[in-house]
């Protein structure tokens, strides 16, 4: 029979023939031949392959480096690699994290909409009219003014984006 | 006092294996990653391999990668650098050494580094035939 | 990987007079948190490695005030104000940014 020009899925072409392609986790040791199968080994530890395969090495695991800010979020395995993230306060500047940066902070003025996450930045947005923030801060949001009324006050300075009401006494009608 | 004993050293040949063991003492071993660092007769130093402080991390430099394996046994306080299919050019002092760390600096950063604080007193590996 | 240099290889010293080690890297040391990862070894003749600075300028516990280290990104300097005849040995920098760890090639103090 004619040799084969292309190989099926998992299995691909090494000298005139089709051999069956290393599962996931597995490395290749050696090709098939007409009387034998394709020989492979899995990975050791700390190391990795995640698809079908004809490698020969295995891929080591991503070491998450404190110094750096990260951790693992996910022990690898030998079909997968280790899955960093980044410690509290600190968030990821690529979908593979590789490095972390500090967690931004929402100046007065602003209040924070969406807390950072290990992988995305803290998210601010400014205090609308009748709320303040007098701080720089990744956690509080946008405080309301004091409502002066229920407290039976009068406000005697204007809020503002960064400031509260100020409230004082009514002024008594002398009879 | 903090203390790193290395062991295991000695003379091999091609292709045998060897494992050093390095002993702590003086201080928490589960809190701190480590490292072996290696030095060859009249050279400078070289990085071998890292291992988290829990051990589920680890990574080794591409010259010994697949045939050196760094790990730990954090209830002995002893760190291991197993050496298999040892070559000539693998003679050389091999060092533990501690990565230093604190709790959070002044910037918000999570763990502090501190360099490389503590070191042992080496371990000579030679491969002859 | 990042490559470290060294310069110069060698640095014979007088007693009592300045000395100073320059160390360059590939690429920026310098981390979003503001740090630079560069640490300074010395190796005494016959002994291990022992840490002197580490983030670039900070000295390690127990190392007199004589050492200091400075510079940013890919240039670093370690200098020694007055050199003591117990400052001799192989002085290394090493980057801390990156796995793996690379060391520089060393510099070599000797008195003259």
């Known amino acids: 029979p004619e040799p084969p020009t292309a190989c099926r899925e998992k299995q691909y072409l090494i000298n005139s023939q089709c051999c069956s392609l290393c599962q996931p986790g597995q490395k290749l040791v050696s090709d098939c031949t007409e009387f034998t199968e394709t020989e492979c080994l899995p990975c050791g530890e700390s190391e990795f392959l995640d698809t079908w395969n004809r490698e020969t090495h295995c891929h080591q695991h991503k070491y998450c480096d404190p110094n750096l800010g990260l951790r693992v979020q996910q022990k690898g395995t030998s079909e997968t690699d280790t899955i960093c993230t980044c410690e509290e306060g600190w968030h990821c500047t690529s979908e593979a994290c590789e490095s972390c940066v500090l967690h931004r902070s929402c100046s007065p003025g602003f209040g924070v909409k969406q807390i950072a996450t290990g992988v995305s930045d803290t998210i601010c947005e400014p205090c609308p009219v009748g709320f303040f923030s007098n701080v720089s801060s990744a956690f509080e949001k946008c405080h309301p003014w004091t409502s002066c009324e229920t407290k039976d006050l009068v406000v005697q300075q204007a809020g503002t984006n960064k400031t509260d009401v100020v409230c004082g006494p009514q002024d008594r009608l002398r009879a | 006092q903090v203390q790193l004993v290395e062991s295991g050293g000695g003379v091999v040949q091609p292709g045998r294996s060897l494992r050093l063991s390095c002993a702590a003492s003086?201080?928490?071993?589960?809190?701190?990653?480590m490292h072996w660092v290696r030095q060859a007769p009249g050279k400078g130093l070289e990085w071998v391999a890292v291992?988290?402080?829990?051990?589920?991390?680890?990574y080794h430099a591409d010259s010994v990668w697949g045939r050196f394996t760094i790990s730990r046994d954090n209830s002995r306080s002893t760190l291991y650098l197993q050496m298999n299919s040892l070559r000539a050019e693998d003679t050389a002092v091999y060092y533990c050494?501690?990565?230093?760390?604190?709790?959070?600096?002044?910037?918000?950063?999570?763990?502090?580094?501190?360099?490389?604080?503590?070191w042992g007193q080496g371990t000579t590996v030679t491969v002859s035939s | 990987d990042i490559v470290m240099t060294q310069s110069p290889l060698s640095l014979p010293v007088t007693p009592g007079e300045p000395a100073s080690i320059s160390c360059r890297s590939s690429?920026?040391?310098?981390?979003?948190?503001?740090?630079?990862?560069l640490d300074w070894y010395l190796q005494k003749p016959g002994q291990s490695p022992q840490l002197l600075i580490y983030?670039?300028?900070n000295r390690a516990s127990g190392v007199p005030d004589r050492f200091s280290g400075s510079g940013s990104g890919t240039d670093f300097t370690l200098k020694i104000s007055r050199v003591e005849a117990e400052d001799v040995g192989v002085y290394y920098c090493?980057?801390?940014?990156?796995?793996?760890?690379?060391f520089g090639q060393g510099t070599k103090v000797e008195i003259k």
């Open positions: 050494a501690r990565r230093g760390m604190g709790s959070s600096g002044s910037r918000g950063d999570y763990y502090y580094y501190y360099g490389l604080d503590v």
């Open positions: 003086g201080f928490t071993f589960s809190s701190y990653g």
């Open positions: 090493m980057q801390a940014l990156q796995t793996p760890r690379t």
């Open positions: 291992i988290s402080n829990d051990g589920d991390n680890k």
């Open positions: 690429q920026s040391l310098l981390y979003s948190n503001g740090y630079n990862f």
């Open positions: 983030l670039g300028s």
